[in-house]
């Protein structure tokens, strides 16, 4: 499940260029936009995927209340700077020398500034809340069946270990998936919750990043789960630093 040798493609990232020019004629794949080599046995980092996307042609309350420090990605797409490992650089700037600090999922966590802005470290997003609203169905889904299918989906499709799926909440028609992964919990080889959430988000939008694999067909006991709205909240290990002006 590395780069497929026979037709030299990257199963986990369609936004790549692959050729048999690796060691011993092995298939090697590079991300569009950055040209960085990617490991096709796992998810590609969100930073490299965003960069590739920007280079491509344009075409009883059980639900969790996001904390006051939760971030939503309101800025949308931008062409990010990635480090040699494919992670977001802590400071991002645009072509007009406007700069800001981002967290590990690339979401802005400070006010925008100029080139003098300092971002001392890349702050880790350790808690992601994926808030979904599903289309009307004949009846509510069985909560435990829904929970099981979503945990299996994150394990089998995104290769995210079940221990990082903290909870699945359901209050028809709202589903919330909580992903938690502290720096200390993440071992080498573990998929990052930010990357898994991004692949899931793209799947939900019908924009699968997987090569040759069918789009997401999520069913609970045979009943299709069709999502009509998605909101993702990001919580960082260190709260974001925005001025009061932004909060009013």
């Amino acid at each position: 499940h590395t780069a497929a040798q026979d037709n030299c493609t990257c199963p986990t990232n369609k936004m790549t260029v692959c050729s048999p020019d690796g060691p011993g004629g092995r298939c090697q794949c590079r991300a569009l936009g950055s040209g960085m080599a990617v490991d096709c046995s796992t998810l590609t980092s969100k930073c490299l995927l965003l960069k590739a996307r920007m280079s491509a042609p344009k075409n009883a309350r059980t639900l969790v209340r996001p904390s006051e420090h939760a971030l939503v990605d309101n800025d949308g797409l931008y062409d990010p700077d990635c480090d040699p490992e494919g992670r977001f650089k802590a400071r991002q700037c645009n072509q007009t020398s406007v700069c800001w600090c981002v967290n590990s999922v690339g979401v802005r966590r400070t006010d925008k500034g100029d080139l003098s802005l300092r971002c001392d470290e890349l702050v880790r997003t350790h808690h992601i809340l994926i808030d979904l609203r599903h289309r009307p169905t004949a009846g509510a889904f069985n909560h435990s069946d829904l929970d099981a299918e979503l945990r299996r989906l994150f394990r089998e499709r995104y290769r995210l270990h079940p221990k990082f799926v903290a909870a699945v909440h359901y209050e028809q028609p709202t589903i919330q998936i909580e992903l938690r992964q502290n720096t200390s919990q993440k071992a080498a080889g573990d998929v990052d919750i930010g990357d898994a959430a991004y692949y899931f988000e793209r799947d939900i939008k019908g924009e699968s990043l997987f090569q040759g694999r069918g789009g997401l067909d999520l069913r609970v006991r045979g009943e299709p789960l069709q999502v009509e709205r998605t909101l993702i909240y990001y919580l960082d290990e260190i709260p974001p630093k925005f001025s009061m002006k932004r909060l009013t």
């Epitope: 499940h1 435990s144 299918e149 945990r151 089998e156 270990h161 079940p162 221990k163």
Partner: antibody, heavy 118, light 109 residues
Framework: QSLEESGGDLVQPGASLTLTCKAS????????MLWVRQAPGKGLEWIGC???????TYFASWATGRFAISKTSSTTVTLQMTSLTAADTATYFC?????????????WGPGTLVTVSS | YDMTQTPASVSAAVGGTVTIKCQAS??????LAWYQQKPGQPPKLLIY???DLASGVPSRFKGSGSGTEYTLTISALECDDAATYYC????????????FGGGTEVVVK
Amino acid sequence: QSLEESGGDLVQPGASLTLTCKASGFDLNNYAMLWVRQAPGKGLEWIGCIYISGGTTYFASWATGRFAISKTSSTTVTLQMTSLTAADTATYFCARDDGSTSYYLNLWGPGTLVTVSS
Amino acid sequence: YDMTQTPASVSAAVGGTVTIKCQASEDIYSLLAWYQQKPGQPPKLLIYDASDLASGVPSRFKGSGSGTEYTLTISALECDDAATYYCQQAYTIGNIDNTFGGGTEVVVK
């Protein structure tokens, strides 16, 4: 690190039986635990699986409804079987995945024999 | 995701080579394992990710394949290799009857 099954017995058709898998030397929470059975002289047959973190369970299509898996303590997982028939006569193994996100079984118990006969 | 394993039995001399094939009904993205089982013992993991050797497994065991077609080759056969070998898809446990192939008995003459 080891696994050991217990609870295998000779039971009558229609009876229920609970098998226990005891884990030693590792933290169950980092793994999925699977049950596999093998009828005498036959191949391996997957029964079901539990993701210990979260407690969600999954079963082979033929096992849904008649089998249940649960974590009963920090070191034990059980397989509950109901409405047993002669076709359920087999050695039952519990196995652990390798801690990755695939289902590679790198640790097995020695198995426990269940015989269903009148 | 049915796993079809062939042949059901194979015989070869000490020092020889045997090849066992496993076909998945759908692409399993090289998430395939091979196990060795001897009578009265639980299975032992030999190969994972289609071609990676598990710890302590001799390099005489070689796994290959991708997509839906996979092969286990045992070369320089030894008497101790006499066992039943099973393939297993390790990709999904959703809506399936079995994750294992039917098994291949290897007889060493």
